[in-house]
């Protein structure tokens, strides 16, 4: 069956190959070909040509559609890994490292401690905070996770906050608080994460991440 | 009512320290910026310096640039001026104001004031 069909492959192969060479003798105006011969295997060829740009067309529309599509609504996404940070501040550090997402440059991580958005809508943002902390050791005051917005010419303001009390194990204890919620961002609005103690944030693969995504 | 008590003004030397405080009550503290702003013998008003909600982001006034530092206790209610290598032209009035919800430049509630000194 194989060998029957290459066969028939070749052949198929051949006759294209006579098509193309007669196309190009009437080109050329051979003598040995009839006029109408010639006429009538152009025509067929000009039909063939027809029938592939118009194909051709087709896909292009569609090719075009779906690019004004996603040009006008392109996946906006971020996730963003814990960095340990020597600085004392209390605003979280973060890195494009491991197994992190950032979709294009329409969202950006700037000095590794905000996503920054350049396309005003709703955004789910989120954040997980693991910490390792012992109630001895640490002030009275439980550990606290802020989820805050910083938009161009504003103050930060708080949009999401958690609070854990402080574990009894020794030397700490584990515990994991996670953030998410549904906001309107404008251009140029910026998120990021605050905690009460830095020092006890835990950057083991996993524990600590941020992100956003636009809905 | 939004209350805003100064405390911790007197007399010090030049090259010399102070720490002013703020307790504030009234509003939620945590809420908005927080602002020193103060006034010299026979002057006007002098910005001085502000500082963000959660305490994230101080502003400075080029003639205290590194020399005072804005900060706050939001457990506390209390706004903070640590004021190091206090020199003559420092001597005034100082207020604690509070910022307009989301604007760094306008106030809506003041203190009393508390009088730095600075002299030999």
């Known amino acids: 069956h194989r060998r029957l069909d290459k066969i028939e492959d070749e052949r198929n192969l051949h006759e294209d190959f006579v098509f193309m060479k007669t196309i190009q003798r009437c080109n050329t105006g051979e003598r040995s070909l009839s006029l109408l011969n010639c006429e009538e295997i152009k025509s067929q060829f000009e039909g063939f040509v027809k029938d592939i740009m118009l194909n051709k067309e087709e896909t292009k529309k569609e090719n075009s559609f779906e690019m004004q599509k996603g040009d006008q609504n392109p996946q906006i996404a971020a996730h963003v890994i814990s960095e340990a940070s020597s600085k004392t501040t209390s605003v979280l550090q973060w890195a494009e490292k491991g197994y992190y997402t950032m979709s294009n440059n329409l969202v950006t991580l700037e000095n590794g401690k905000q996503l920054t958005v350049k396309r005003q809508g709703l955004y789910y943002i989120y954040a997980q905070v693991t910490f390792c902390s012992n109630r001895e050791a640490s002030s009275q005051a439980p550990f606290i996770a802020s989820l805050c917005l910083k938009s161009p010419g504003r103050f930060e303001r708080i949009l999401l906050r958690a609070a854990n009390t402080h574990s009894s194990a020794k030397p700490c204890g584990q515990q994991s608080i996670h953030l998410g919620g549904v906001f309107e961002l404008q251009p140029g609005a910026s998120v990021f994460v605050n905690v009460t103690d830095p020092s006890q944030v835990s950057h083991g693969t996993g524990f600590t991440s941020f992100g956003l995504l636009k809905l | 009512e939004v209350q805003l008590l100064e405390s911790g003004g007197g007399l010090v030397q030049p090259g010399g320290s102070l720490r002013l405080s703020c307790a504030a009550s009234?509003?939620?503290?945590?809420?908005?910026?927080m602002s020193w702003v103060r006034q010299a013998p026979g002057k006007g008003l002098e910005w001085v310096s502000t500082?963000?909600?959660?305490?994230?982001?101080?502003y400075y006034a080029d003639s205290v640039k590194g020399r005072f530092t804005i900060s706050r206790d939001n457990s506390k209610n209390t706004l903070y001026l640590q004021m190091n290598s206090l020199r003559a032209e420092d001597t005034a009035v100082y207020y604690c104001?509070?910022?307009?919800?989301?604007?760094?430049?306008?106030?809506?509630?003041w203190g009393q004031g508390t009088l730095v000194t600075v002299s030999s």
């Open positions: 500082i963000s909600p959660i305490g994230v982001t101080t």
């Open positions: 009234g509003f939620t503290f945590e809420e908005y910026g």
């Open positions: 104001a509070k910022n307009a919800y989301d604007r760094k430049s306008n106030f809506d509630y």
